[in-house]
């Protein structure tokens, strides 16, 4: 049994209207936007912020007033910040959640150094393997270099968020005193989920500077 | 890095037309609404016009409807806004910016183009 | 004239405490996430404040803005001289469909 205790005031039996309550959602999974009502019979919308209104068709999009909206097969128009709004007594009132997704691109892998690289032996190498991704992703970043057994190689990781539009991930190689065993090829791996994607350079040793 | 260049502003006389173009970069584009919004010299910020993600829906400031047509191509990651009949009071720099989905505000912006509209 | 209302300018010396106001109506303001917006002299406009109250990375917790009805405001706490700029307040307003933005505010640092 299901009791709707209408309430003229508030359509919504939950209302977030200062900060929006965050939906994790799964694409391609059922999303329900979780705005259920105070009483059946009253009338709700669905946008999508800033233009776009989300109709219901019975099938991919469902309303039921004691759930809210009920999206059966969820994509990334589904993404972002979507609105319940119902006026009452000539009154509008909205309800927002963000709906966030897990993903796993990678949209760019790169060694921020030039290629080849070339140093003096008895110097220190630093390589610095940049990943790009999209809000909401993690990535799993790899080295293999020459003399990996030894484990020559210390690591640093770190993650810039001040990006609106993206995640960069840092991973910065350094070796000190490089010797003739360390030349060879240095790779960097970024995995994320079932995605993956690498890149590569040539570290070339030699004994004196010469023009 | 993300970026938004616009560009095809310049000088051009009342009645006359432009197109001005917003190329966007480091982000994926065809996620997010776009929007116009310009500023006249010594004046605040007015909003011009927004388009969703897909280009399906558009919607324009009162002053420029009937006379500007906001639309963005996501192929080339690209946003345009069509300007006719354009009138003295239409100068200004002019700005693209994006809705994006953290903020859902104006959180990415152009460095501006600039329309001047003289005879 | 602008949607939104905001006091042409305010003042305040290094240190201080300044609040800039925005008031509008029940269909933007009430029912809709203000925006905030500094506009350094010669640059583009940069997001400050969002949802209301948040702040994106980067921006320094001595801003935070707050929205009550159909009025908002932003504070600006421990005033520096590099927050001399212009501000504006924006939201999204239901009966025009599109963005209203303040006149703005003219910071001074003195």
């Known amino acids: 049994i299901y009791i709707f205790i209408s309430d003229t005031g508030r359509p919504f039996v939950e209302m977030y209207s200062e900060i929006p309550e965050i939906i994790h959602m799964t694409e391609g999974r059922e999303l329900v936007i979780p705005c259920r009502v105070t009483s059946p019979n009253i009338t709700v919308t669905l946008k999508k912020f800033p233009l776009d209104t989300l109709i219901p068709d019975g099938k991919r999009i469902i309303w039921d007033s004691r759930k809210g909206f009920i999206i059966s097969n969820a994509t990334y128009k589904e993404i972002g910040l979507l609105t319940c709004e119902a006026t009452v007594n000539g009154h509008l009132y909205k309800t927002n959640y963000l709906t966030h997704r897990q993903t796993n691109t990678i949209i760019d892998v790169q060694i921020s150094t030039p290629r080849p690289v070339k140093l003096l032996r008895g110097h220190t190498l630093v390589l610095n393997c940049t990943a790009t991704t999209p809000l909401n992703t993690r990535v799993q970043m790899t080295w293999s270099y020459p003399d990996e057994k030894n484990k020559r190689a210390s690591v640093r990781r770190r993650i810039d968020q001040s990006n609106s539009h993206a995640n960069i991930f840092y991973s910065v190689l350094t070796i000190d005193k490089m010797q003739n065993k360390d030349k060879g090829l240095y790779t960097c791996r970024v995995r994320s989920g079932p995605s993956f994607k690498s890149v590569n350079t040539s570290v070339h040793i030699y004994d004196k500077a010469f023009i | 890095e993300v970026q938004l260049l616009e560009s095809g502003g310049g000088l051009v006389q009342p009645g006359g037309s432009l197109r001005l173009s917003c190329e966007a970069s480091?982000?994926?584009?065809?996620?997010?609404?776009m929007n116009w919004v310009r500023q006249a010299p010594g004046k605040g910020l007015e909003w011009v016009a927004t388009?969703?993600?897909?280009?399906?829906?558009?919607s324009h400031a009162p002053a420029v409807k009937g006379r500007f047509t906001i639309s963005r191509d996501n192929s080339k990651n690209t946003a345009y806004v069509q300007m006719n009949s354009l009138r003295a009071e239409d100068s200004a720099v002019y700005y693209c910016?994006?809705?994006?989905?953290?903020?859902?505000?104006?959180?990415?912006w152009g460095r501006g183009t600039t329309v001047t509209v003289s005879s | 004239q602008s949607v939104l209302t905001q006091p042409p300018s305010a003042s305040g010396t290094p240190g201080q405490r300044v609040t800039i106001s925005c008031s509008g109506s029940s269909s933007n303001i009430q029912n809709n996430y203000v925006y905030w917006y500094q506009q350094l002299p010669g640059t583009a406009p940069k997001l400050l404040i969002y949802f209301n109250s948040q702040r994106p990375s980067g921006v320094p917790d001595r801003f935070s803005g707050s929205k009550s009805g159909t009025s908002a405001s932003l504070a600006i706490s421990g005033l520096q001289s590099e927050d001399e700029a212009d501000y504006y307040c924006g939201t999204w307003d239901d009966s025009l469909n599109g963005w209203v933005f303040g006149g703005g505010t003219k910071l001074t640092v003195l």
């Open positions: 480091g982000f994926d584009f065809s996620t997010y609404a």
């Open positions: 910016s994006s809705t994006t989905g953290t903020t859902h505000g104006m959180d990415v």
């Open positions: 388009i969703n993600s897909e280009g399906t829906i558009t």
